[in-house]
Amino acid sequence: LTCLGGFASPGPVPPSTALRELIEELVNITQNQKAPLCNGSMVWSINLTAGMYCAALESLINVSGCSAIEKTQRMLSGFCPHKVSAGQFSSLHVRDTKIEVAQFVKDLLLHLKKLFREGQFN
């Protein structure tokens, strides 16, 4: 078991891989969307700038009972250095408008694709 430890538990996922996997998951969500995502739930929109991953998690974590975004919520928690719980909003999170989860995911996906193309993986 000692010898296999490294094999069974590979080291940290490279940031580029983690970002690519998050993008793939968001693409999957948008393409498989038949009924309104999360039944039309609305969340706070975010500034897609510094602290974006934590802000995205802070917004989406409030939506419960929506299996379609549970994996995204888990993946975003890997990008956010601090623990995020429902109802928590950082000072970076400006609450100016709410949008449907479907639109939130589309906006986030477009921005993450741009970051990936530019090589900004963190």
């Epitope: 309104p36 039944n39 039309g40 739930s41 609305m42 409030n62 939506v63 009972g65 929506c66």
Partner: nanobody, 116 residues
Framework: EVQLLESGGGLVQPGGSLRLSCVAS????????MDWVRQAPGKGLEWVST????????YYADSVKGRFTISRDNSKNTLYLQMNSLRAEDTAVYYC?????????WGPGTLVTVSS
């Protein structure tokens, strides 16, 4: 089970006022963030306003800022939306919603028609 019932809609002339109410049951109202959302004929959902559980935080869409006021009475499990200086573009079905829940848990809505 979450239940919400809106009332107070109707036909009003441009520049007029209406007060919408929403009675909530089936959840702990006083700790819930609450929203007003609207849907104009043939259009998508548009967020209108949000109020925090404590009433300390109130938030408005730019399109209604300065004209609409959201409030709540936790002792009556009731959410309100005071709508002043109404415009034709405010015509919509208005829904009260427990924040972050899907449409299946929203009320049936109340129709507001602004027309001369």
């Amino acid at each position: 089970e979450v239940q919400l019932l809106e009332s107070g809609g109707g036909l009003v002339q441009p520049g007029g006022s209406l007060r919408l109410s929403c009675v909530a049951s089936g959840f702990t109202f006083d700790v819930a963030e609450m929203d007003w959302v609207r849907q104009a004929p043939g259009k998508g959902l548009e967020w209108v306003s949000t109020i925090s559980p404590s009433r300390r935080g109130t938030y408005y869409a730019d399109s209604v800022k300065g004209r609409f006021t959201i409030s709540r009475d936790n002792s009556k499990n009731t959410l309100y939306l005071q709508m002043n200086s109404l415009r034709a573009e405010d015509t919509a079905v208005y829904y009260c919603a427990k924040a972050y829940t899907g449409r299946s848990l929203w009320g049936p809505g109340t129709l507001v028609t602004v027309s001369s």
